[in-house]
Structures are given as C-alpha cells and as structure tokens.
C-alpha cells in the first residue's frame, strides 16, 4: 500500500498527490494509478434552513497547501499521532522489537491480500479509461477540507474475474497512471469541490497488471474569486399594499453551493434594515418580498453566501414606495 | 381583486384518486408559490403542500409524502392537487393559497370537501 | 416540525369585554435576521381562514385596531380590547420561521 498519501490545493482547479513508496513491496513498484471521483455535498445543506437563528454555517475549507515538503499539519491521516511539534523518544528495545514484527504482519498480510483477495486485472492506460473493479461501498469521510485521510480498505470478495462494475453505474472514473515518481498533479477540476481520491500501488506493468489494496485520501479545490457573485441586474415589482417582490439570478457555478442571501434594504433618511433569504425560500420566490413599506426612496443591495463565505454585494438597485393607507412600516419575505 | 376558486372535491373510497384544481385571477399567478391546506372535520388546519413560483420545486407534508403530487400550470393560472391512494384521515376541506413566505397564506380560496369513504 | 400551543381552546366573552389568546411555539420563532414570523388569522365559521396579524404585531389591511398582537421569542398573545359580534369564530396562531409552517389548534372564542 502506498504510504502517507497527502493531498492539498493550490488553485480552484488543482489538487497536487504525494505519498511514499510501499515500505515492504512485493517485487519493484513499476507505477501507481490514481483514480479521482467529485464528491457530492452532503444533502443536509440543500434542505437546512442556515438563516435560522443559531444556526452555524457549514465549515468547507480547501486544502491548504504544503508547509514544507514533509509537513502534515494541514493533512492528517487517521493513523498519525497529532501531538504537535515535540520530539519522538529515542525507542525501547520492547518497540524496536515490536515494529519488526508489525513490519513482518504486513508483508505477510500484504502477500495474502495480492494472493487471495485480489484478482489481477485488465485496465488500459491513460485518463478516461474504465474502471473495471469491484465495487466498493462508498465510506463516509466525514468533512473533507484541511484534513485529508488516508484509508487503506479490503474490497468485498469478488465473485466474477475482471469485468465488474464500476463505483457509479455508466460512469467512467478518470484515472491517471505515475511512473517513477510520488506526486501527481490533477488538474481541470471544478472549484471549491470535493474530490475522493484513489492510489495503489503496481508491480507489474503489463495487462495483467497485480495492484496493492487502495488508500484513499480527500481533498476540496480552492473557491474560485468571483463565483459566489450575482450577475445581472436585481429586479423588482411593486405590488398592491406596498410589497416589493425582489429578484435576482442565483450564481451559475458556486463554490459548492449557496445557502443564504443577505438582502440590505433602506429607505432614504433612515438605517440598514437587513433580511436573510434561505435557498428554500429563494426556490419558492425567485427572490424575496418587502412588505407593507412606509412611502419613500429606497435602495436594495443582495449578496449571496455560499460554502466558501460571502459572494460580493450587488450595486444598489433603487425604488419608490408611493403613499398607501395604513401601512405599518415593516419588512417581508 | 385577488381570487382563488378550488374545484374537484367530492366523495371517494379509500385507495383511490382525486384531482383538485384552484383557479388563481387577480394577481400575477407566476410570480407566487402557491400552498395547499386542508381542515379535517371540526379539526384545525394542516399545511399539505407548496410549489415554487415556476413549479420546479416542491414540498410536502410527511403525511402526504408520496401519495400527493401539486403541480400547476402558469399559462392557465391553475394549481392541482393530485391525490392518490386516499385515507380516510384524508377527509378535509381542501383551501388553495397564496404564499407570503414568514407570513404563511395572504389570500385564501373558499375550500372544496374531500371525502374519504367507503 | 415546530409545534404551536394555543390556550385556552375555548373562550366564552361578553360582547364589548376584552378577550386574550395565547400561543407558545416549541422553538424560539427568531429568524436570523431578527424578524419574528408568528402570524394570527381568524376563521369565521363555514368561511375560510384571513389573516389579521403578521410578524407579531403589523396588523393586515382593514384589520381593525381593536386586534393587538404581541410577543416575542416562544411567547406570543393576541389581545381584542372590545370584542364584537363580527369577531367570533376561531383564531390560530402560525410560525413562517421553521419549515414546515405549523398551525396551533385554534381557540374558539364564543359568546357568553
């Protein structure tokens, strides 16, 4: 298995892979495949309403890029120790000891898994090739950001040879084959987006290649600067009792997602007042409605938040509120 | 003036369909999510369904998850509520309504009576 | 869901006496932005429902003054200062905060 894979973004595209080589492999690594598949936003944030009050917003952060070339900081696995910056004690004859026999364990286990478990396979080279493994039950990593992790995983025992499905039925998971280094850079990836990413490690460079169980790591993409601005001018209608229905285009390829609008509204002479549209709320509205507003001019600006912060506000949009019998000076969604 | 006027009420066994519809005039029908609300018998009222102003997105009650579809037509300034697999506990008087979202329902249709017997 | 309290369910008045309602939500109706989304509407009987009170305390248009709503956080009330006979019927309370929307079970107010 290759070992410490780490994964970091430097721009909104690109996800740089490194890791070490097997500590004990079978025969002479000959390449390494990575294999790479967008991971979708957890569900609990289309349906959550993140403008209820006390309610945090999501934390995404990208991964971050390295610190130097052996840091981890940012790039944890779940196997490593996070005790911080001190010194590893000089080690006891007991541990010595006992590394060599663990040492042993996975040669031996890793003998097994290339006997038993695995069945060799066919794949052809090159990105956008098939991916003719079995497959395997997605695990649940969590909040991929500034950690990424590294899980080595037993596939189920295979019942058929080398024809099984695909992870996702009719999707061809690009991969990439490295040869004769540790590193990879992925590029031509969506922005501010998970990425589950695939390494094993190969000995055998023909059709019939032999490859070591997988580690997985995980990583986001950097947010792209201007995605989470509103384009295209904010719009408005002014219905009967006063009420102002607000609209504007939602972001065409956010960072991740957008879960809010800020809507900042004031009339001439008076202060902010300020309504939080959630994306429910915007689905069903295309925007949202001021109600029962006291005669003047008013000015309107809109700024989306998604899961990487705040979009840019939009250039104020103006208004007049003609005079209307009993109205109480209040706001609406 | 704003009116809504619901239609296809009726009496149905259970386990079968009914399709309602609510005739929306008065106001710009596209720009409004529209509800559905029911009232059982001497009961108070029950949210049951709401559509997006363009009808790309909706939303149910658990207790109708599944056996009812709101849709609407935008040319036609119509609402309908598809109900299948009909229950007694169904038994209500049915109201279509504008959304006012925070506010809930700013105008309200007059209802149509759906029974559920066998 | 958020769940909407009202007492009492029943409420015998005199003509030209005040009358009081309550409603209690299960969760603090506070919206992120500071607005408080508890609306009132009345139900006269065979009639379908109106509103008469947004956001606490704005009343509709050609709701008449005598209705005053008040409130905040869980606690919410409805007082009438002089109740007339157009006035009877059943009044609910319900929450625009939470998804789903969510009714109370409505206080009938009748004559005494």
């Known amino acids: 298995v290759p070992l410490d894979p780490i994964s970091v973004s430097n721009s909104s595209s690109q996800i740089i892979l490194k890791w070490k080589p097997p500590s004990d492999p079978n025969g002479n690594i000959t390449h390494y495949l990575v294999f790479w598949e967008r991971q979708a936003e957890d569900s609990e944030l289309f349906e959550l309403d993140y403008c209820l009050k006390g309610l945090k917003l999501p934390s995404r952060t990208w991964s971050p890029p390295f610190e130097s070339e052996d840091s981890q900081k940012h790039n944890q696995s779940e196997y490593e120790d996070s005790a911080g910056e001190c010194c590893s004690c000089p080690k006891t004859d007991s541990q010595i000891l006992k590394e060599l026999e663990e040492s042993s364990f996975r040669k031996t286990f890793e003998d097994y898994l290339h006997n038993v478990v695995f069945v060799p396979r066919k794949t052809s080279s090159g990105t956008g090739a098939e991916d003719p493994r079995p497959s395997r039950k997605r695990r649940s990593l969590g909040d991929v950001g500034n950690v990424t992790v590294a899980v080595p995983t037993v596939a189920a025992f295979p019942n058929t040879s080398s024809t099984s499905v695909p992870t996702s039925p009719e999707e061809h998971r690009p991969f990439e084959k490295v040869v004769n280094k540790e590193s990879l850079v992925i590029s031509g990836l969506r922005h501010f987006t998970g990425y589950r990413i695939e390494l094993q490690a190969c000995n055998q460079d023909t059709p019939e290649e032999r490859c070591s169980v997988a580690a997985y790591v995980s990583a986001r993409t950097m947010p792209e600067a201007k995605a989470d601005d509103i384009v295209g001018p904010v719009t408005h209608e002014i219905f009967e009792n006063n009420v102002v229905h607000l609209m504007w285009q939602e972001p065409k390829e956010p960072n991740g997602l957008i879960v809010l609008y800020e809507v900042s509204y004031r009339r001439y002479g008076d202060e902010e007042l300020h309504l939080c549209v959630s994306r429910k709320h915007f689905a069903l509205e295309r925007g949202c409605r001021l109600r029962g507003l006291s005669p003047g001019n008013y000015s309107v600006r809109i700024r989306a938040t998604s899961l990487a912060g705040n979009g840019s506000w939009t250039e104020p949009t103006y208004f007049y509120v003609t005079d209307y019998l009993d109205v109480p000076s209040n706001i609406a969604k | 003036e704003v009116q809504l006027v619901e239609t296809g009420g009726g009496v149905v066994q259970p386990g079968r369909s009914l399709r309602l519809s609510c005739a929306a005039s008065g106001f710009t029908f596209s720009s409004y999510a529209m509800h559905w609300v029911r009232q059982a018998p001497g009961k108070g009222l029950e949210w049951v369904a709401v559509i997006s102003y363009s009808g790309s997105n909706k939303y149910y009650a658990d207790s109708v998850k599944g056996r009812f579809t709101i849709s609407r037509d935008n040319s036609k300034n119509t609402l309908y509520l598809q109900m299948n697999s009909l229950r007694a506990e169904d038994t209500a008087v049915y109201y279509c309504?504008?959304?006012?979202w925070g506010f809930g329902f700013d105008y309200w249709g007059q209802g149509t009576t759906v029974t559920v017997s066998s | 869901d958020v769940v909407m309290t009202q007492s009492p369910l029943s409420l015998p008045v005199t003509l030209g006496q005040p009358a009081s309602i309550s409603c209690r939500s299960s969760h603090s109706l506070v919206y992120g932005d500071g607005n408080t989304y508890l609306n009132w509407f009345h139900q006269r009987p065979g009639q379908s429902p109106r509103r008469l009170i947004y956001k606490v305390s704005n009343r509709d248009s050609g709701v008449p003054d005598r209705f005053a709503g008040s409130g905040s956080g869980t606690d919410f009330t409805l007082k009438i200062s002089r109740v007339e006979a157009d006035d009877f019927g059943v009044f609910y309370c319900m929450q625009g905060t939470h998804w789903p929307y969510t009714f109370g079970q409505g206080t009938k107010l009748e004559i005494k």
């Open positions: 309504a504008r959304h006012e």
